[in-house]
Interface confidence: low
């Protein structure tokens, strides 16, 4: 109806079958997958393919990042007959098939997910018995991982004509709000958020001058959680000392 | 030909739950997801969720969180959603499409109910 | 979320008219989707991936934009086109619809 998928409905037995001749390639994902860091979140893939009850040997495929030339992160293969789908890689031991490519589907779990795992990725199919042919994904599916704060580093460092400068920055995805307090700052100093570049989820503020001895609190925050770290100033010992 | 049927109109007390159904027919159910969308008079459509039967893995719109539960029986081809704790908010009409995420990016919902009428009153 | 503002909220044309509605999205979207509908019935797929009209649309229909600002264009307004027009996307969840355009030809 909307492109050139064909459908048809037969009739075996007097029991209605909803069988797709399947006359192309497709495959169905997701635009997007949403999960929490630490969580484990499925990436679904299904697809159709022409060759009615292929039964040969195949191999699964996920790949992150780029569709046909981003690095895999998931393997298996599947001997002529076999619906065991047996794993030859799975990056940091994390990532598991959960679908069945027997039945058109390299459904993927993936564990323990990390912020650094924010990324799209892409399902991949190949037929390799008397059949030779693959698919894969082009658009992908999106896995968007959500964290709490926390805060990677806090740090005094000196600037020209003998000031001191503190650095705080932190992760978090939404990217957190970071606010600094200390002597003669008031409660919360908001400071503008800035994600680095190439470093989508780390958020850096800056205190540009130091005027006062004590400590210095970094507090970052988003609709997750938050998290706070310190650094102490004493510059009668002319050195700086952190703690978090 | 692809249709998907609806289950009749309803009138149910506030506080109540209602269940309507999906029928698919003429295509492959488990390789499609199902997409439930309300739509009130002056409210537009709203996207609740979807459903995909094959592996029976579910999107939330998480305003509908605790409202809606999403639910497919392959055996049948039928998805049912679930609304529970009614109040007048949730009087409207609710249909159900087949969501075609393709391999390319071009999702649609390409085939729609006829829609199921809820009506909330005292 | 996404939010999607469609613009008129109505309109009227008269037949053989160029008729533009847009839909604004307050954060970039890759695509944009449109459905017609018309009273009573449900709505159907319209326009896909921005500018792809589904089988069945009339060739006068076209679609466009990029980023936040996206339109749905007829060269030459018939009767048979009276309904409401409703922009979806799918970038980012949950997937939004806007309010709708109504045309109505005179």
């Known amino acids: 109806f909307v492109r050139t998928k064909i459908d048809t409905t037969e009739n075996l037995l007097n029991t209605e079958v909803h069988s797709s001749p399947a006359q192309r390639w497709s495959m169905q994902v997701p635009p997007e997958v949403s999960a929490e860091a630490g969580d484990a979140a499925v990436l679904p893939c299904t697809f159709t393919h022409p060759h009615r009850h292929y039964d040969g040997p195949l191999t699964a495929i996920w790949r992150a990042g780029e569709p046909y030339a981003g690095p895999q992160v998931f393997r298996c293969a599947a001997a002529r007959g076999s619906e065991l789908c047996q794993t030859a890689l799975s990056l940091h031991g994390r990532f598991r098939l959960l679908g069945n490519p027997r039945r058109n589907d390299l459904s993927l779990r993936v564990e323990r997910l990390a912020l650094a795992d924010d990324r799209r990725y892409f399902c991949r199919v190949e037929f390799a018995g008397d059949v030779h042919d693959r698919y894969e994904s082009r658009h992908g599916v999106r896995l968007h991982v959500t964290a709490a704060p926390r805060i990677v580093n806090i740090s005094v460092l000196p600037s020209p004509a003998h000031a001191f400068r503190a650095l705080c920055t932190a992760e978090g995805e939404p990217p957190p709000a970071l606010a600094w307090s200390g002597p003669a700052l008031g409660n919360s100093l908001a400071a503008v958020r800035s994600p680095r570049e190439g470093h989508g989820h780390l958020v850096t503020a800056e205190l540009p001058a130091l005027t006062h001895d004590g400590r210095y609190t970094c507090t970052a925050a988003n609709s997750l959680g938050r998290s706070e770290a310190s650094v102490y100033l004493f510059r009668f010992h002319g050195a700086s000392g952190a703690s978090t | 030909q692809v249709q998907l049927k609806q289950s009749g109109a309803e009138l149910v007390r506030p506080g109540t739950s209602v269940q309507m159904s999906c029928k698919a027919v003429g295509y492959t159910f488990t390789n499609y997801w199902i997409g439930w969308v309300k739509q009130r008079p002056g409210h537009g459509l709203e996207w609740v969720g979807d459903i995909h039967p094959g592996i029976n893995y579910t999107n939330n719109n998480e305003k509908f969180r605790g409202k809606a539960t999403l639910t497919a029986d392959t055996s049948s081809s039928t998805a049912y959603m679930q609304l529970r704790g009614l109040t007048s908010d949730d009087s409207a009409i609710y249909y159900c499409?087949?969501?075609?995420?393709?391999?390319?990016?071009?999702?649609?919902?390409?085939?729609w109910g006829q829609g199921t009428s809820v009506t909330v009153s005292s | 979320q996404i939010v999607l503002s469609q613009s008129p909220a109505l309109l009227s044309a008269s037949p053989g008219e160029k008729v533009t509605m847009t839909c604004r999205a307050s954060s970039s979207v890759s695509y944009m989707y449109w459905y017609q509908q018309k009273p009573g019935s449900s709505p159907k797929p319209w326009i896909y991936a921005t500018s792809n009209l589904t089988s069945g649309v009339p060739a006068r229909f076209s679609g466009s934009g990029s980023g936040t600002s996206y339109s749905l264009t007829i060269s030459r307004v018939e009767a048979e086109d009276a309904a409401t027009y409703f922009c979806q996307q799918w970038n980012s969840k949950p997937w939004t619809f806007g309010g709708g355009s109504k045309l109505e030809i005179r």
């Open positions: 499409a087949r969501v075609d995420y393709d391999y390319d990016g071009s999702y649609i919902m390409d085939y």
